[in-house]
């Protein structure tokens, strides 16, 4: 779908405050197939050479209220023998996401968009760039 | 802030459609300090033992319109010699995020929330669980 032309009942895109008062349906549409969702393994956090743990971050004034955040278990990576490899670092992969925060002193269903940087998992990096041959 | 008691001007939380018509200010608040944002390295995708590429996913009817998605470069991981290690797999770390999608046939500033599964980066996993000793 492309943007439809502005009608008199729609806020004008040029209006200074149009972004400040959009209407949103917060009933989550599951656009993921249940197959895709169930195929997505949640055990990578243990099987990775840079394993991580997940901590629960809850804020009742945020949408989504609950976000699970990753933290790397070790500073180093785990080698094939299960030992820490001091030449390789375990680093957090972060992603910037948008969340909705309730506008303070307003109705419970009035929000503003806010950016949040969340840890998603860890990866193992060397201190120098290597390319597969 | 906590939820304020319902007043006559606020929709009732138990009303069947209360989640379907909330107001959102889309002017993004950057709650990340510029320090935190600038400290976030973007070179992990090359230095990782499970390197990845990023592709641009753009949808003008989505907010945010542009999302960068990761794809693993190899099926296997890259070892210390820069060779592919056939005992270790490079796997995509995915995160479920919420995006706003324009409601079809409605004003350009009326959205619904939709789930989206995005690749954030890759990690190297073994086929068996190993714990660092």
């Amino acid at each position: 779908a492309v943007l439809i032309p502005q009608s008199s009942v729609c806020p004008n895109a040029e209006a200074n405050n149009f972004l400040q008062n959009v209407k949103v349906n917060l009933k989550v549409i599951n656009s993921l197939s249940s197959k895709a969702s169930s195929r997505r393994p949640s055990d990578y956090l243990n099987r990775s050479t840079s394993p991580w743990t997940l901590s629960r971050n809850e804020d009742p004034d945020r949408y989504p209220s609950v976000i699970w955040e990753a933290q790397c278990r070790h500073q180093r990576c785990v080698n094939a023998e299960g030992k820490l490899d001091h030449h390789m670092n375990s680093v957090l992969i972060q992603q910037e996401i948008l969340v909705l925060k309730r506008e303070p002193e307003k109705c419970p269903f009035t929000f503003r968009v806010e950016k949040m940087l969340v840890g998603v998992g860890c990866t193992c990096v060397s201190s120098i760039v290597r390319h597969a041959s | 802030a906590v939820l304020i008691p319902q007043s006559s001007v606020c929709p009732n939380a138990e009303a069947n459609n209360f989640l379907q018509n909330v107001k959102v200010n889309l002017k993004v608040i950057n709650s990340l300090s510029s320090k935190a944002s600038s400290r976030r390295p973007s070179d992990y995708l090359n230095r990782s033992t499970s390197p990845w590429t990023l592709s641009r996913n753009e949808d003008p009817d989505r907010y945010p319109s542009v999302i960068w998605e990761a794809q693993c470069r190899h099926q296997r991981c890259v070892n210390a010699e820069g060779k592919l290690d056939h005992h270790m797999n490079s796997v995509l770390i995915q995160q479920e995020i919420l995006v706003l999608k324009r409601e079809p046939e409605k004003c350009p500033f009326t959205f619904r929330v939709e789930k989206m599964l995005v690749g954030v980066g890759c990690t190297c996993v073994s086929s068996i669980v190993r714990h660092a000793s």
């Epitope: 949640s42 956090l45 009742p60 209220s65 | 939820l3 479920e96």
Partner: antibody, heavy 121, light 106 residues
């Protein structure tokens, strides 16, 4: 219709383990966390911990940390609670309950029917 | 941990009477939740986020409070309200419940 159906009653020996299942239906399994709560005979409610089927994340009441293991199988929409090193004080009804990840003020809205675990030598 | 203390532990009430159950928290919390439990049944969510009645809960029930002091009120008790009521907090780990208040109909 939302349902959380738990496995049947168990009788266990002290020192052994028990694994209780909770099969969810009537909603999107990964939109909700699964919390576990127990109730000893004639007593109040005690929170054990939470599992997030979406991410695999778990968080435990410290009292149960190390003894309780919460897991979930997304393919069958089933959550599990395993309790090890059982003692007589673990005799209780164990409940699973769901918790909406997106808008948490709803709290724990639907509960399983409960699974009675009896620990006796 | 936050301790929730309910008062009274037990109350025998005649139908149509007004009933007040209080829940006092050892530290300030943002919301209180109330559950109703009848013998040999699972708990049912009764009041959430302090004020909101769960679906199907009669309007004679109400919830109020803030900080450390919360109340569940039944305006005109009916026989079907005989049950044990638990308050619950999830503002701080571990999540905790009150010891319960058993309501009996005279």
């Amino acid at each position: 219709e939302v349902q959380l159906v738990q496995s049947g009653a168990e009788v266990k020996k002290p020192g052994s383990s028990v694994k209780v299942s909770c099969k969810a239906s009537g909603y999107t399994f990964t939109d909700y966390e699964i919390h576990w709560v127990r109730q000893a005979p004639g007593q109040g409610l005690e929170w054990i911990g939470v599992n997030d089927p979406e991410s695999g994340g778990t968080f435990y009441n410290q009292k149960f940390d190390g003894r309780a293991t919460l897991t979930a199988d997304k393919s069958t929409s089933t959550a599990y609670m395993e309790l090890s090193s059982l003692r007589s004080e673990d005799t209780a009804v164990y409940y699973c309950t769901r918790y909406y990840r997106y808008e948490s003020f709803y709290g724990m809205d639907y509960w399983g029917q409960g699974t009675t675990v009896t620990v006796s030598s | 941990e936050i301790v929730l203390t309910q008062s009274p532990d037990f109350q025998s009430v005649t139908p149509k009477e007004k009933v007040t159950i209080t829940c006092s928290a050892s530290s300030s919390i943002s919301y209180i939740y109330w559950f109703q439990q009848k013998p040999d049944q699972s708990p049912k969510r009764w009041i959430y986020a302090t004020f909101e009645l769960a679906s199907g809960v009669p309007s004679r029930f109400s919830g109020s409070g803030s900080g450390t002091d919360y109340t569940l009120t039944i305006n005109s008790l009916e026989a079907e309200d005989a049950a044990t009521y638990y308050c619950h907090q999830r503002s701080s780990y571990p999540w905790t419940f009150g010891q319960g208040t058993k309501l009996e109909i005279k």
